[in-house]
């Protein structure tokens, strides 16, 4: 039998892009009954949390104050039930933003285009950087990267109404240290009449999966957790 528990889920609360000097919050969602959670950063032990009482909560929050470039990078977490440790979570990339300067974002041929037109975004930052990033609001996980000395281009190809929305860009000093965000550029794509009226606009709220869904246990949850554990053992 494998002497490990299932890996936990690691998430950033609200966003994985944290302005410098602000607090980041990472959640590690493991299992009811876990007596200890550890946060590891780039292979080092960063923090330990012991929930009280352990059987009533399925995870913990780790608060990282005063965000800076030394705290930006890859995080993972692990938990313990009794003397049994879980597998390590997937890696979460935590990025520090608002470093140094603010880039300028522009779009060609313009912010209002017709479906099928080719569109290119340009991100410009005069201070030394080689990597640029383009993000669409509400889709912050879908980062597009491009390279250039002071300017990078992001060709979008023929656009559809799905490309509608607000875009920002960042200059990147390394994978985990980004500039201030540019001012947003709103791309408006008009299409066929029937398409236009039906096409939803992108949400401007943060990504829905960037929330910590830690729950306190009820009797029903306990039964479900037990059933799930039994089912997993049967599957093994």
């Amino acid at each position: 039998p494998k002497q490990t528990l299932p890996k936990p889920i690691i998430r950033a609360e609200s966003t994985y892009m944290v302005p410098k000097e602000k607090q980041a919050t990472l959640c590690c969602q493991g299992s009811y009954g876990a007596v200890e959670y550890q946060l590891h950063f780039e292979g080092s032990l960063f923090a330990v949390e012991r929930p009280k009482p352990p059987e009533r909560i399925n995870g913990v929050k780790f608060h990282i104050p005063d965000m800076n470039s030394r705290k930006a990078g890859r995080y993972s977490c692990i938990y313990r039930v009794g003397e049994l440790w879980s597998e390590r979570s997937d890696l979460l990339d935590l990025v520090v933003t608002e470093m140094y300067d603010t880039p300028t974002l522009s779009v060609h041929p313009g912010p209002e285009v017709t479906s099928g037109e080719k569109v290119t975004f340009y991100c410009r930052l005069d201070t030394a950087t080689s990597m640029f990033l383009l993000l669409k609001e509400g889709r912050s996980r879908d980062v597009q990267r491009s390279y250039g000395k002071v300017q990078a281009e992001f060709p979008m190809g023929p656009v559809t109404t799905a490309h509608r929305g607000s875009y920002r860009c960042f200059g990147s000093y390394n994978n985990y240290a980004w500039s201030f965000p540019s001012e947003p550029v709103k791309l408006l794509v008009t299409g066929d009449i029937e398409n236009t009226s039906l096409a939803p606009t992108d949400p401007t709220f943060p990504d829905s999966w960037d929330t910590c869904l830690l729950t306190r246990e009820t009797g029903l949850q306990k039964d479900l957790a037990l059933w799930d554990h039994t089912a997993q053992n049967l599957l093994r």
């Epitope: 494998k2 080092s44 313990r80």
Partner: antibody, heavy 116, light 106 residues
Framework: QVQLQQSGDDLVKPGASVKLSCKAS????????INWIKQRPGQGLEWIGR????????YYNEIFKGKAILTVDSYSNTAYIQLRSVSSEDSAVYFC?????????WGQGITLTVSS | QIVLSQSPAILSASPGEKVTMACRAS?????IHWYQQRPGSSPKPWIY???SLASGVPARFSGSGSGTSYSLTISRVEAEDAATYYC?????????FGGGTKLEMK
């Protein structure tokens, strides 16, 4: 049960390269980092570096860069350390250790003797 | 790099005695971990994250400290505790070990 089985003791000539192995069993190899540690006779412990079995990414103690190369073979669940151009300074016991919530499982160690 | 200094280098104790060994870091670390090593064996994890006992470690052992000053205490020493104890930090790269405290029985 979890085990880290290291290859046998080795005797090599100065200037040669040597590759030592650490075979893992009893757990999901890709879910845990592996560290390598050096201990010279009658001395303390020195961290060489670590390898991430899932990706093969490596992190080294600066003083071992150019001396040690860490690799993994995820098919055989084995971590390796290659030592280049060895000298008497490299004569030591080399341990591998798994990182869970702590460095919880260690190999039995490999005694490397460098002698002409 | 963070240098860990252990004291004393050698500690002599009689069974039943309470003993404490120290580990001082050259700069602040989040946690200290302790290993027990007997001659010819690999190090065994003993105390992790400053104060948590590793699996199978007797409750007479305890760890404490913060910042740059840490310690390992044995409330009532037993003959089987004779070994070398190393402190370690893996909060900061490169990870480092102390020079060890050798616990001997009188």
């Amino acid at each position: 049960q979890v085990q880290l089985q290291q290859s046998g003791d080795d005797l090599v000539k100065p200037g040669a390269s040597v590759k030592l192995s650490c075979k893992a069993s009893g757990y999901t190899f890709t879910s845990y980092w592996i560290n390598w540690i050096k201990q010279r006779p009658g001395q303390g412990l020195e961290w060489i570096g670590r390898v991430v079995p899932g990706s093969g990414r490596t992190y080294y103690n600066e003083i071992f860069k150019g001396k040690a190369i860490l690799t993994v073979d995820s098919y055989s669940n084995t971590a390796y350390i290659q030592l280049r151009s060895v000298s008497s300074e490299d004569s030591a016991v080399y341990f591998c250790a798994r990182v869970g919530g702590y460095w919880d499982y260690w190999g039995q160690g490999i005694t490397l003797t460098v002698s002409s | 790099q963070i240098v860990l200094s252990q004291s004393p280098a050698i500690l002599s104790a009689s069974p039943g005695e309470k003993v404490t060994m120290a580990c001082r870091a050259s700069s602040s670390v989040n946690y200290i971990h302790w290993y027990q090593q007997r001659p010819g064996s690999s190090p065994k994890p003993w105390i992790y994250a400053t104060s948590s006992l590793a699996s199978g470690v007797p409750a007479r052992f305890s760890g404490s400290g913060s910042g740059t000053s840490y310690s390992l205490t044995i409330s009532r020493v037993e003959a089987e505790d004779a070994a070398t104890y190393y402190c370690q930090q893996w909060s900061s790269n490169p990870y480092t070990f102390g020079g060890g405290t050798k616990l001997e029985m009188k």
